[in-house]
């Protein structure tokens, strides 16, 4: 999906009033100092892109974030206010709930989160770019 | 606890160069960016720039290039200002300060370190 | 760059007055508007972000709202810790800017 024509400015207010409260709670106890970011993104469109594939793809440590309640918001998010985005998740939702598995926050779901959490750090303020 | 520990002030030359530090602790440096922030005494705040310590990535106010270079040393967790040809008028008070959690503000700052320019 | 135009420059308060700044942007800045206060030998403290999102810890009393180019800080009953210089500032477009600030004084 091309993130080029979303309402960056309503999904940053969406992340701002809640998906950001709910990745803090996933993180919560967690040492400020235990991971670096590692994943990184250049403009809005990149930044959404990278936060899809790190919220809803499975990986291996780490199979169950698109469960979890801010996946979810984001989801919402994207839906509303990226045209055409519900149409090209019908397929990977339906995968989804082949494979859906319990609930379980491992260290590599955490340092996920904390990637996300700089990925949408870069996505409301996009650093380099004369925005 | 998170804390941007500055360097001490400086009474320096016109004509000369001069580099404040900022040390980091209590975060993973590289995950947020550090600004720094002007003030002139009595006077409000002047944005100078912002860099990313995990790449280097910098952008600059216009008033400032020039005048000042930001650098990052990961390997200390500092972040770094210089600013050249000085002048009477970059006589003031030099804050760095970390992005917050969202992105959208200024979360921790240092304590300031007054530079003094004069003959 | 945007100009934050910030009023008044001076406020005389007493303890438990309300007190209402204002912040006006020069372009729309969308809700990417941020307010610090500044104690006198102090560096600044963040209070509200995003427009009317509270910082951790700080007090109920402080809000913040507006939108676009118009925007405005309130204390709803000041203490008298509150005195110190109130700024605003724009996080939408590079340069970054900042309001002139206004000092709020003991009548």
């Known amino acids: 999906y091309d993130f080029t024509n979303c309402d960056f400015e309503k999904i940053k207010a969406a992340y701002l009033s809640t998906i950001s409260k709910d990745l803090i709670t996933y993180m919560s106890g967690t040492k400020s100092t235990e991971f670096n970011n590692t994943v990184s993104c250049s403009n809005r469109p990149h930044c959404l892109t990278e936060i899809q594939s790190l919220t809803f793809n499975p990986t291996a440590g780490c199979a169950s974030l698109a469960k979890e309640m801010f996946a979810m918001k984001t989801k919402a998010a994207l839906a509303i206010w990226c045209p055409g985005y519900s149409e090209t998740q019908i397929n990977a939702t339906q995968a989804m709930k082949k494979r859906r598995k319990r609930k379980v926050t491992t260290n590599k779901c955490l340092e996920q989160v904390s990637q996300l959490q700089g990925l949408w750090r870069r996505f409301n303020r996009p650093l380099l770019k004369q925005q | 606890q998170v804390q941007l520990q500055q360097s001490g002030a400086e009474l320096v030359r016109p004509g000369t160069s001069v580099k404040v530090s900022c040390k980091a602790s209590?975060?993973?440096?590289?995950?947020?960016?550090i600004e720094w922030v002007k003030q002139r005494p009595g006077q409000g705040l002047e944005w100078i720039g912002v860099?990313?310590?995990?790449?280097?990535?910098?952008n600059y106010n216009e008033n400032f290039k020039g005048k000042a270079t930001l650098t990052a040393d990961k390997s200390s967790s500092t972040a770094y200002i210089e600013l050249s040809r000085l002048t009477s008028e970059d006589s003031a008070v030099y804050f760095c300060a970390r992005e917050d959690n969202t992105g959208t503000a200024f979360d921790y700052w240092g304590q300031g370190t007054t530079l003094t320019v004069s003959s | 760059s945007i100009v934050m135009t910030q009023t008044p420059k001076f406020l005389l308060v007493s303890a438990g007055d309300r007190v209402t700044i204002s912040c006006k942007a020069s372009q729309s800045v969308s809700s990417d508007v941020t307010w610090y206060q500044q104690k006198p030998g102090q560096s600044p403290k963040l209070l509200i972000y995003y427009v009317s999102n509270h910082y951790t810890g700080v007090p109920d009393r402080f809000t913040g709202s507006g939108y676009g180019t118009d925007f405005t800080f309130t204390i709803s009953s000041v203490q008298a810790e509150d005195l110190a210089v109130y700024f605003c500032?724009?996080?939408?477009?590079?340069?970054?800017?900042f309001g002139a600030g206004t000092k709020l004084e003991l009548k």
């Open positions: 209590g975060y993973a440096f590289t995950n947020y960016l």
């Open positions: 500032q724009q996080h939408h477009r590079f340069p970054l800017t």
């Open positions: 860099i990313d310590p995990g790449n280097g990535d910098t």
